[in-house]
């Protein structure tokens, strides 16, 4: 079938990085600068993506593949092929419509993106709180009192007080 196709359509012989030039008797011409063709048999080359503004070039365009972009520091990619750049927040924050806001008491975010998530409820697994949670870190659950050897006591600090000057959002 391939041989038949190439007899019927000379363009099918044009490899990636070239296009079938109708103006030159359908010979294979190299893609012009700032364009590419990622598959063979193409009648045109595609314009390379330009990584500008808040986007920066992660991979240069070549004659056979498009440029790839990522985001300038302080931002991260969103969407297929990094179609958008979204603002980073600090750990212990989440991005809202009004910008980065601290996690509410009882929640945490250990990344620069994403939302604040509730601390683990150790008691649901019959465990105790070994290390209190913060805005940046989940609680660490310890062994349940039953798991402790006789005479040992569970390390269960009192419920954490609100941080000074920190009110729930």
């Amino acid at each position: 079938f391939e041989r038949t196709r190439s007899l019927q359509d000379p363009c099918s012989n044009c490899p990636a990085g070239t296009f079938c030039d109708n103006n030159r008797n359908q010979i294979c011409s190299p893609c012009p600068p700032n364009s590419f063709s990622s598959a063979g048999g193409q009648r045109t080359c595609d314009i390379c993506r330009q990584c500008k503004g808040v986007f920066r070039t992660r991979k240069e365009c070549s004659s056979t593949s498009n440029a790839e972009c990522d985001c300038t520091p302080g931002f991260h990619c969103l969407g297929a092929g990094c179609s958008m750049c979204e603002q980073d927040c600090k750990q212990g924050q989440e991005l809202t419509k009004k910008g980065c806001k601290d996690c509410c008491f009882g929640t945490f975010n250990d990344q620069k993106r994403g939302i604040c998530r509730p601390w683990t409820n150790c008691s649901l697994d019959g465990k105790s709180v070994l290390v209190n949670g913060t805005k940046e870190r989940d609680v660490v659950c310890g062994p349940s009192p039953a798991d402790l050897s006789p005479g040992a006591s569970s390390v269960t600090p009192p419920a954490p007080a609100r941080e000074p000057g920190h009110s729930p959002q």
């Epitope: 330009q50 500008k52 503004g53 969103l78 179609s83 750049c85 419509k97 910008g99 980065c100």
Partner: nanobody, 121 residues
């Protein structure tokens, strides 16, 4: 033709002040957030400040806190970046950009051509 034009850059001594303007033509600035970015020689572009269409301010660069402020005059279709207590490390080309919201930028956003700010004695 939709465009943003920055102005107000120049040479200033350390500790001095400048006010940059970002004027829009061909579209209504009030419908957009406006962000200021800067790029120093040999460094990557850095977010500075952004003001939303409703006037909420986002600070991208901690280094400008307490020194730079952003404001908008929708009647004049212009946003201003007031820069006080300038330092040599503020030297850069300053660009304004018009995203829909301060938190998210796309390749469709309008960018200005930039204005040079040089802080030197």
């Amino acid at each position: 033709q939709l465009q943003l034009v920055e102005s107000g850059g120049g040479l200033v001594q350390p500790g001095g002040s400048l006010r940059l303007s970002c004027a829009a033509s061909g579209f209504t600035l009030a419908d957009y957030a406006i962000g200021w970015f800067r790029q120093a020689p040999g460094k990557e572009r850095e977010g500075v400040l952004c003001i939303s269409s409703s006037g909420d301010v986002t600070i991208y660069a901690d280094s400008v806190k307490g020194r730079f402020t952003i404001s908008r005059d929708n009647a004049k279709n212009t946003v201003y970046l007031q820069m006080n207590s300038l330092k040599p490390e503020d030297t850069a080309v300053y660009y304004c950009v018009a995203p829909r919201i301060c938190s998210t930028y796309s390749s469709d956003d309008y960018w200005g051509q930039g204005t040079q700010v040089t802080v030197s004695s």
